[in-house]
């Protein structure tokens, strides 16, 4: 389009911007360390720095670690994003009673109302149910037979909720408390990464029954439970939902009791190819590998060197150049192991065994 | 590996058995008889790095796709350099810590 | 920066001793604390992930505890091959920090 011309000319004038073809655009050129929040970013503010995966940049500009949903009777309210926690609630069925920073440290099950009283207000996350004595017709809060019988003297408008069991009391965030094994459980998670020691450390017990809400008898509002990070497939199935682990990946929508966690590219980045509930290969956006000149040398006296391609040819890519300084001496190979205690007792999709080799090389050798 | 104050070494760290740009590598430094010091990591996706302040004008990370190898490189080495830096790499659980290490390589500085 | 304080700085103990060790933070660190072994000449080696779960391969006599700024690690019953310096590692937030460590000597 040669009415894009001049946009493109006065990027190529500006070391701080670059022409993005596919928006027809100057985007300025995120400086190195800094990672763009958008496909083309217009001003410094649309760069930031990146933390790992399962890490949410705080107001004070750190890498801090989100809180994680693990135990038993929490759920994910919300994903982890790139600049917030994420957040978790009591499971349904139960409500908090002691709060903790972006979860809870103590769940309860909602009390089921006991005779002569119907529920006022249901039993939520955050609150216990609420009962009222029966009028003399039919609530429409009677949400079970249990809740609608006939009212008797004394009334209690809250009944004792039942703490979870054993009961949490800690306001920890992280995978179970009292060292269970990581292994007990490996064999049913078969989403994890090879080298993962476990998806969440606890011990998997029977799902059976479990009531969305206390399952009082004539009440339908049972359902299958599902062990965490798993939802209730359309069979009535307990189905892993996906991981958003990798590295390129982000936390669309979280695991839910009935759906899947989706996962979606981080920013700067577009899915190549997707997959069920994600994405399978996600690529730089835009694409710069191909831009990369790679000049082979000999890895024992100087390491790989990457060439830029001239400026105002490619995108916002930081290949990472030789600095001008002599060439450094090369200290001998690092091997790193691998546990391979960890990748033996879980499901490896590959035969290769892990090893970091460490020279002047950590190689992962798990022997 | 021996080097002069002054000079500049590079190690690398090379991984094997799992796919290399799915983790980020981090770097750590122990000095002798002494605890271990956080450098930085790099994620070998994207080549972005970050650096533990302290270290920041002294190390810098790069990663080679092809070969799955992770490099660190000292400038400037003082006395203060010797030490035994290892790579060490997270799991999916990224806030467990660091089951897997390298060996460690052991850079002295004497003149 | 988030600062890890570990004590003892060394001790000695006996075979079939209980050993506890200290870790405190400077700030909250919830209960993202590690804690790694490390025998004379070898890499560091993950006991504990999350303040309290024993990693992979782990004999049970090892335990960890805490959450916020007090972290313990106890050794039930301490063995000889059991000699090493033990440091404390916190993953909550960046830099990533350690404790100096402290040296277990057996008796």
């Known amino acids: 389009f040669p009415q894009d011309r001049p946009f493109e000319d006065t990027c190529h004038g500006n070391p701080s911007h670059y022409y993005d073809k596919a928006v027809r655009r100057c985007c300025y050129r995120c400086p190195m360390g800094l990672f763009p929040t958008q496909q083309c970013p217009q001003r410094p503010t649309d760069c930031r720095k990146q933390c790992e995966p399962d890490y949410y940049l705080d107001e004070a500009d750190r890498c801090t670690a989100c809180v994680t949903c693990s135990r038993d009777d929490l759920v994910e309210k919300t994903p982890c994003a790139w600049n917030s926690s994420r957040v978790c609630e009591c499971r349904p069925g139960m409500f908090c009673s002691t709060s903790a920073v972006n979860s809870c440290a103590r769940c309860f099950f909602h009390s089921v109302c006991p005779a002569g009283m119907i529920v006022k207000f249901p039993g939520t996350a955050q609150k216990n149910t609420v009962c009222e004595p029966a009028s003399p017709g039919v609530s429409p809060a009677c949400a079970s037979p249990e809740n609608c019988k006939e009212p008797s003297s004394g009334t209690i408008p809250q009944a004792k909720p039942t703490p979870v069991s054993p009961a949490t009391s800690s306001a920890s965030t992280m995978p179970v408390r009292g060292g269970t094994r990581l292994a007990q459980e490996a064999a049913s998670k078969l989403t994890r990464a090879p080298d993962s020691p476990s998806s969440v450390g606890r011990p998997s017990s029977d799902p059976g029954l479990s009531p969305t809400q206390p399952c009082p008898e004539g009440s339908g509002d049972c359902r299958k439970q599902c062990e965490p990070d798993y939802y209730l497939d359309e069979a009535g199935r307990c189905t892993a939902c996906v991981s958003c682990s990798r590295d390129d990946l982000v936390e669309k929508t979280p695991c839910a009791w009935n759906s899947s966690r989706t996962c979606e590219c981080r920013p700067g980045m577009i899915c190549a190819t997707s997959a069920t509930n994600s994405c399978a290969r996600c690529v730089p956006y835009p694409i710069c590998a191909a831009e990369t000149v790679t000049k082979p040398q000999d890895m024992a006296e100087k390491d790989t060197t990457f060439e830029a391609p001239p400026l105002g040819t490619q995108p916002d890519c930081n290949p990472t150049p030789e600095n001008g300084e002599a060439p450094a001496s090369t200290s001998p190979t690092q091997s790193l192991l691998v546990d391979s205690q960890a990748s033996k007792t879980l499901p490896i999709p590959t035969s290769a065994p892990v090893a970091l080799s460490s020279t002047g090389k950590p190689v992962l050798d798990a022997g | 590996a021996a080097a002069k104050p002054g000079a500049a070494v590079k190690m690398s760290c090379k991984a094997s058995?799992?796919?290399?740009?799915?983790?980020?590598m981090h770097w750590v430094k122990q000095r002798p008889g002494q605890g271990l010091e956080w450098i930085g990591y790099?994620?070998?996706?994207?080549?972005?790095?970050d650096y533990n302040q302290k270290f920041k004008d002294k190390a810098t990370l790069t990663a080679d796709k092809s070969s799955s190898t992770a490099y660190m490189q000292l400038r400037s080495l003082t006395s203060e350099d010797s030490a035994v830096y290892y790579c060490?790499?997270?799991?999916?659980?990224?806030?467990?810590?660091?089951?897997?290490w390298g060996q460690g390589t052991t850079v002295t500085v004497s003149s | 920066d988030i600062v890890l304080t570990q004590s003892p700085k060394s001790m000695a103990m006996s075979v079939g001793e209980r050993v506890t060790l200290s870790c405190k933070a400077s700030e909250n660190v919830d209960s993202f604390v590690s804690w790694y072994q490390q025998k004379p000449g070898q890499s560091p080696k993950l006991l504990i992930y999350g303040a309290s779960n024993r990693y992979t391969g782990v004999p049970d006599r090892f335990a960890g505890s805490g959450s916020g700024r007090d972290f313990t690690l106890t050794i039930s019953s301490v063995q000889a091959e059991d000699l090493a310096d033990y440091h404390c590692?916190?993953?909550?937030?960046?830099?990533?920090?350690f404790g100096a460590g402290t040296k277990l000597e057996i008796k």
């Open positions: 060490a790499k997270k799991t999916t659980q990224t806030t467990w810590g660091f089951p897997f």
């Open positions: 058995g799992y796919t290399f740009t799915d983790y980020w």
């Open positions: 790099i994620n070998p996706n994207t080549a972005y790095t």
């Open positions: 590692g916190q993953n909550y937030r960046y830099p990533l920090t």
